[in-house]
């Protein structure tokens, strides 16, 4: 190899000034003995390279590129040979921004999948390979003082969420959690929560169905329907609150809320609808008194309210 | 401290009905499901019933469902088990139990033995 | 209903041993699976619960482990008042049911 670069900083800011030096050997020998050393970025060449000869008789071109607003390039030294640019040595360079801090840090217990699944907003764009890393650790108390560290979780590329498997967790117990983003220019961290893996339990909703009429039961007053909901089995035993949720099918009505209704309630009457309508359903949970995390709505029941009744006229007849 | 006192076991004859009562302290008894587990002499551990916090949920096992009423009354802090139609196989000592939030018993009662016999 | 079925149903082992007890589950239970300690003439006493956690007061030689179908209970170093009969239990959904126990012994 004739020729060698060696720059400043590979990575830099993006805009900051980079500094490059490009040596040629004294022993190729087959080159003019007072080269010019040329400089380009990517496909541009770039003036203002110093050129010097030094004392063991190598060649040094020494360029300051003032502002690298590329966010990826190549820098290569080059010589003239005959009528074409032959390349001694080039590198690679990047500019970019160091993370900023990771930000909206939220987690959520699936007891489901058994599991903390963590998210956060990534911030801008760095234009470098950045790492995030979930962080956590198990503690007595507030999260002042630091217990058992837990594994790192580290997402898939492209990612802002991570998932801590329950043997890592202590349900019960304060926990320490932050995501660290880091690339060549630097790390940042976001601000810590500290949480019991139950307080964000978020349940999956009961299934809602029609209640099966009972031969010694009245039917359905007109505009009215009788519901009933089967919780779901592996949160039963979590005290709940939950709502429903309902709309006319038809039309453009949005939705009308009812609740907060008990879990234990399992069998409800709701009235003041359409009679004769057909209207969609749902219902959702959330762990109460305790905290947690609304479910998501159940998938839809539909169902059809009663005719109104027939009014009777009554008819005087005169003799 | 959180306690729990059964009470009402004792000698029946197939077909008779005993009432067990749990009495709790040390917790906030409204807020919890209770629960009944069984143990027949020499043999393993199985769960009767248990209860929702404030009564609405009462599932049973197969083998009690028609017979067995679990209830409680939170403003005494006690839970019951009404047993009717009782047979020889439900000769065991009877635990009450508090539930955690995933369904675990803890803490137990010392136990009250029934005995189904002629 | 989901059955539980617990491995071996008894074992002899000396204190310092390192004990494994094992549970299945007929159908997946995620980790809604609680290990008790019952000594005779006592109540049963919760030892951990949703599969690994340790239940306040209890020695950190007890640790579960397990998800799905298959659960572990284990006894780092076996102490002389660890003797007892040990049961798994499924929380996922009712009827909430037992595996048969495992009896520890004094070889």
């Known amino acids: 190899e004739c020729g060698h670069i060696s720059v400043s900083a590979p990575i830099v800011h993006l805009g900051d000034p980079i500094t490059a030096s490009c040596i040629i050997k004294q022993n190729c020998s087959h080159l003019d003995p007072e080269p010019q050393i040329l400089w380009r970025l990517g496909a541009e060449l770039q003036p203002g390279g110093r050129q010097q000869r030094l004392s063991d008789g190598t060649q040094e071109s020494i360029i300051t590129l003032p502002h690298l607003n590329h966010t990826q390039a190549f820098l290569s030294c080059a010589l003239n040979w005959g009528n074409s640019l032959q390349i001694l040595d080039q590198v690679e360079l990047r500019a970019g921004y160091p993370p900023a801090i990771p930000h909206n840090l939220s987690c959520l217990m699936n007891l489901t999948t058994s599991s903390l699944i963590c998210q956060w907003e990534p911030g801008p764009e760095t234009h470098l390979p950045t790492s995030f890393t979930l962080k956590s650790f198990k503690s007595r108390g507030n999260c002042q003082t630091q217990g058992d560290s837990i594994l790192d979780c580290v997402p898939k590329d492209g990612q802002s969420h991570c998932s801590i498997p329950a043997k890592h967790l202590l349900l019960y117990q304060n926990m320490g959690i932050w995501v660290q983003a880091e690339n060549a220019l630097g790390t940042s961290m976001s601000p810590q929560l500290c949480l019991d893996p139950m307080d964000v339990v978020k349940l999956e909703p009961p299934m809602l169905r029609t209640m099966d009429p009972s031969p010694e039961a009245a039917p359905p007053q007109a505009g009215c329907l009788q519901l009933s909901w089967e919780p779901w089995q592996p949160g039963l035993h979590i005290n709940q609150k939950c709502e429903l949720r309902h709309k006319p099918q038809r039309g453009e009505a949005s939705w009308a809320l009812v609740g907060p209704l008990p879990l234990e309630a399992l069998q409800y009457e709701l009235c003041g609808l359409l009679p004769a309508t057909a209207y969609t359903l749902q219902i959702r949970c959330i762990r109460w008194p305790l905290p947690g995390h609304w479910s998501d709505w159940s998938p839809s029941l539909e169902l059809r309210t009663t005719e109104r009744a027939p009014t009777h006229h009554h008819h005087h007849h005169h003799h | 401290e959180v306690q729990l006192l059964e009470s009402g076991g004792g000698l029946v004859q197939p077909g008779g009905s005993l009432r067990l009562s749990c009495a709790a302290s040390?917790?906030?008894?409204?807020?919890?499901?209770m629960g009944w587990v069984r143990q027949a002499p020499g043999k393993g551990l199985e769960w009767v019933s248990s209860?929702?916090?404030?009564?609405?949920?009462?599932p049973y096992a197969d083998s009690v469902k028609g017979r067995f009423t679990i209830s409680r009354d939170n403003s005494k802090n006690t839970l019951y088990l009404q047993m009717n139609s009782l047979r020889a196989e439900d000769t065991a000592v009877y635990y009450c139990?508090?539930?955690?939030?995933?369904?675990?018993?803890?803490?137990w009662g010392q136990g009250t033995l029934v005995t189904v016999s002629s | 209903d989901i059955q539980m079925t617990q491995s071996p149903s008894s074992l002899s082992a000396s204190v310092g041993d390192r004990v494994t007890i094992t549970c299945r589950a007929s159908?997946?239970?995620?980790?809604?699976l609680n290990w008790y300690q019952q000594k005779p003439g006592k109540a049963p006493k919760l030892l951990i619960y949703?599969?690994?956690n340790l239940q306040n007061g209890v020695p950190s030689r007890f640790s579960g482990s397990g998800s799905g179908t298959d659960f572990t209970l284990t006894i780092s170093s076996l102490q002389p008042e660890d003797f007892a009969t040990y049961y798994c239990?499924?929380?996922?959904?009712?009827?909430?049911?037992f595996g048969g126990g495992t009896k520890v012994e004094i070889k």
């Open positions: 209860i929702s916090s404030s009564g609405g949920v009462t």
């Open positions: 159908q997946g239970i995620s980790s809604y």
């Open positions: 239990q499924q929380s996922y959904s009712t009827p909430l049911t």
């Open positions: 040390g917790f906030t008894f409204s807020l919890y499901w």
């Open positions: 139990a508090k539930l955690g939030e995933l369904g675990w018993f803890d803490p």
């Open positions: 949703y599969a690994s």
